[in-house]
Amino acid sequence: SGVFQLQLQEFINERGVLASGRPCEPGCRTFFRVCLKHFQAVVSPGPCTFGTVSTPVLGTNSFAVRDDSSGGGRNPLQLPFNFTWPGTFSLIIEAWHAPGDDLRPEALPPDALISKIAIQGSLAVGQNWLLDEQTSTLTRLRYSYRVICSDNYYGDNCSRLCKKRNDHFGHYVCQPDGNLSCLPGWTGEYCQQPICLSGCHEQNGYCSKPAECLCRPGWQGRLCNECIPHNGCRHGTCSTPWQCTCDEGWGGLFCDQDLNYCTHHSPCKNGATCSNSGQRSYTCTCRPGYTGVDCELELSECDSNPCRNGGSCKDQEDGYHCLCPPGYYGLHCEHSTLSCADSPCFNGGSCRERNQGANYACECPPNFTGSNCEKKVDRCTSNPCANGGQCLNRGPSRMCRCRPGFTGTYCELHVSDCARNPCAHGGTCHDLENGLMCTCPAGFSGRRCEVRTSIDACASSPCFNRATCYTDLSTDTFVCNCPYGFVGSRCEFPVGLPPSFPW
């Protein structure tokens, strides 16, 4: 289906005469009749097989024909056809004079014809106009023509029907050749198939409109490429729908049994080590100083008296700490800072090495005690002196200082004041009415010259580094008890400290 269009442009009839040569009165009021028919080698009268059309009076004698297509007029003239355009045609254009208003053929006199032209040829469908001019003795007609397809018809012969649509039956426009051109987002022979969201899984996804991705049962995700696990699957995944494959650390049909409670819940406190011991169970191994199922309770680690050699224990956040007495070190004050090479035993004590020389023990002579034999044994605790005598420690033994009138080792004997030479150390005895008086030689004092008054050996503070000084009464010498980290007779040498420990 298409339209043969004829555009009349100019008609010249300068003399205003009819085909017979007779002039028109008052002028030739000209209209046209057009006949379109199948191709004839010699155009002859007969049915206008492709159609006819007439115009109103377009002008008088000579005139140009206005293009009226935009105004809804009749130029170009339209000759529609409802068949495949054959590509060839015959065209007859007659110019007629209209003496009155009735333009019907039967109303016109036979000699009202002004001119008649006939052409034939081939004509392809197209938008371009073919310009032609036909001249006779008295008239000239200029015109152009073309064949175009009707709406929705396409192709070289206007034989291909194509009506654009955007509905359930298709989503397309028509190309010039009549082929379908799918609207964006549609595909298929009739553009009925939507193009799904890019990446939408071919098997697991589909769409009912473009850029959509609807998932088939068992699949999910923007692109329908994630399977849906079995309903109730807790800590699992799937590779095909409705499966449930447990993640690491989970068990049970629905992966809801915690096989790795330690990792998932961190139940152990205070740096304890957690061990999984089956479904939803665990064991905490506590660090020192903690107890309880989750090692949540803090122990006082000093309760077990861990510090040795007189060390004092202090509780700390991360355990305990032993404060060691002088001469000891180590976590539990178990190591001595001295060895026998340092001559640590005083008052004639003998040194014995222990633990391959790491520490030592002193074997003390009678009357001395202490880890370094630095303490004199007090032999006066039993009050052996009679008659109010005063007991005095003297080196390895003891002696009694008797009241006037008494003598003997334990003041057990009554004597005259000077009879028994009560003045010691060569002291001179003087009898007095109420007792006696001794005059003592140099270096001695006391009522009986019994007290040695040589200079106190510790008076000069001979011990360094805050060491404790003891006087060795048997030799009038001093003994230094060194604090932790020092050795030597005066504690003047720092020892190489033991390596530091992390506690």
């Epitope: 699957c233 449930c244 494959t245 447990c246 049909l253 629905f254 049994q257 479904q279």
Partner: nanobody, 120 residues
Framework: EVQLVESGGGLVQPGGSLRLSCTAS????????IGWFRQAPGKEPEGISC????????YDADSVKGRFTISRDNAKNTVYLQMNSLKPEDTAVYYC?????????????WGQGTQVTVSS
Amino acid sequence: EVQLVESGGGLVQPGGSLRLSCTASGFTFDDYAIGWFRQAPGKEPEGISCISSSGSITYDADSVKGRFTISRDNAKNTVYLQMNSLKPEDTAVYYCATPGIAACRGIHYWGQGTQVTVSS
């Protein structure tokens, strides 16, 4: 093709007993763990019990502990669920399932189910 067929379901009074059977085919029975789960109308499925390929019972749901016992007979390719002291809340469709591996860790195949109704 893996197939699991359950049987033994039915109507039982509260306090009564039932024994469900699950007969398997299409795979080497000894190699797979087998378990039971159930689903009551409008509720999520609940894992009941599972027995590993070696026969160790991997777990029992708290709701059935002491009442339900799972066992397997490899010679008959069958797993059993002995259900005692049944309660109305045990009413559900009971499914036999396997993770397709030796340990009770998931579900890959399951049967059509057997209905258990506990009602007086």
